[in-house]
Interface confidence: low
């Protein structure tokens, strides 16, 4: 899997999970989240050569097409596969609210 | 939806469905498929600005991060959302076989 266990331990130009820490105030301008201050969101990036962690049959077709027609603009892209939620604390007035924001943390990637 | 009904009728730089016809022999080097000779595979391409058809909360976070930090390499990507199968005819020896190849045709796109 193109997850932290693999990607953070290998230098990989192809599609892989990349570390990204996001500070809610500094990076997003969000002041409404009280906790946490930020989190390890991660992101996916890298090339998608033929058969590299292809998501669907179409991805395989597109990457093969791109191999044979390298000048073409049609090529697969490295995107998130498994995501996890993040528990946040925010306020409505003086009332603290705990909520899970779904799909906030990328755990693994794929070519799609 | 970023499908043919919208994307093929509008000039759109942002993430959208793009037409792509693939000839099995010419574009993929596949000689084993007897029918069809090719098909409208389509593909997804275009920019993913903040809130443009975002797939997940992480995509929204990433596109907003990218807006505030335009020099960052972390940005969402335009990829396939809905896919459809393609029915093909091929031969094993002299015996014709009909099969459905799943996820061969892109019908709509999303930012992920």
């Amino acid at each position: 899997a193109l997850d932290a266990a693999y990607c953070f331990r290998n230098v990989q130009d192809n599609c892989c999970l990349r570390p990204l820490y996001i500070d809610f105030k500094r990076d997003l301008g969000w002041k409404w989240i009280h906790e946490p201050k930020g989190y390890n969101a991660n992101f996916c990036a890298g090339a998608c050569p033929y058969l590299w962690s292809s998501d669907t049959q179409h991805t395989k077709v597109l990457s093969l097409y791109n191999t044979i027609n390298p000048e073409a603009s049609a090529s697969p892209c490295c995107v998130s596969q498994d995501l996890e939620p993040l528990t946040i604390l925010y306020y409505i007035g003086n009332t603290p609210k705990i909520e899970q924001l779904s799909n906030m943390i990328v755990k693994s990637c794929k070519c799609s | 939806a970023l499908d043919a009904a919208y994307c093929f009728r509008n000039v759109q730089d942002n993430c959208c469905l793009r037409p792509l016809y693939i000839d099995f022999k010419r574009d993929l080097g596949w000689k084993w498929i007897h029918e069809p000779k090719g098909y409208n595979a389509n593909f997804c391409a275009g920019a993913c600005p903040y809130l443009w058809s975002s797939d997940t909360q992480h995509t929204k976070v990433l596109s907003l991060y990218n807006t505030i930090n335009p020099e960052a390499s972390a940005s969402p990507c335009c990829v396939s959302q809905d896919l459809e199968p393609l029915t093909i005819l091929y031969y094993i020896g002299n015996t014709p076989k009909i099969e459905q190849l799943s996820n061969m045709i892109v019908k709509s796109c999303k930012c992920s």
Epitope: K37, G38, L86, Y91, P96 | -
Partner: antibody, heavy 118, light 108 residues
């Protein structure tokens, strides 16, 4: 001034029930959460859980979930910590504390020493 | 379960600077709070939200956070600063967690 006054020390036998109290004064009781913290003899602080006295919403540490019950009576500005069946390992000092905003405790009670021994 | 790690004890000479650390996997993303507890007394909040000081707490007390380590700094240490110090923060489910505590000894 803000004060949290806790009930007095208790000596109990294993299997007995107990309810200790924490009375808040000098502030709007329903606008702040009340947390309970355990300190076993010679040991560190352990967060047990908290209550929103305004709406009686509670949140427990996984270590204490099902072991204790936190409640409150907003009409008398008092929070409670109770056990239905005490164990010797419940012997500890128990503090209540006011939770300001979210995660920090700005005022503490003086503590209630609970001793469970046969 | 999530843990915050503190040194068991820290010694500082009278008038010098003491630094007490608190480390945990989530600490880079969450606020840390610090409490002082003297023998036989209830804890007292000395730093909240990593670096903010409640009114009544001397300026000698300051807090910072770098990476996954929060630090409580006590400058110009006095005999009255001798106490146990606890950090507190959260796990990923926003359950509060205390560090194990650090006994500060002021020498001289």
């Amino acid at each position: 001034q803000v004060q949290l006054v806790q009930s007095g020390a208790e000596v109990k036998k294993p299997g007995e029930s107990l309810k200790i109290s924490c009375k808040g004064s000098g502030y709007s009781f329903t606008r702040y959460y009340v947390a309970w913290v355990r300190q076993m003899p010679g040991k560190g602080l352990e967060w047990m859980g908290w209550i929103d006295p305004g709406q009686s919403n509670t949140r427990y540490s996984p270590s204490f979930q099902g072991q204790v019950t936190i409640s409150a009576d907003k009409s008398i500005s008092t929070a409670y910590l109770q056990w239905s069946s005490l164990k010797a390992s419940d012997t500890a000092m128990y503090y209540c504390a006011r939770m300001l905003a979210w995660g920090w405790f700005d005022y503490w009670g003086q503590g209630t020493l609970v001793t469970v021994s046969s | 379960s999530y843990e915050l790690t503190q040194p068991l004890s820290v010694s500082v000479a009278l008038g010098q600077t003491a630094r007490i650390t608190c480390s945990g996997d989530n600490l880079g993303g969450y606020y840390a709070h610090w409490y002082q507890q003297k023998p036989g007394q209830a804890p007292v909040l000395v730093i909240y939200d990593t670096s903010d000081r409640p009114s009544g707490i001397p300026e000698r007390f300051s807090g910072s956070n770098s990476g996954n380590t929060a630090t409580l700094t006590i400058s110009r240490a006095q005999a009255g600063d001798e106490a146990d110090y606890y950090c507190a923060s959260y796990d990923s489910s926003l359950m509060m967690v205390f560090g194990g505590g650090t006994k500060l000894t002021v020498l001289g």
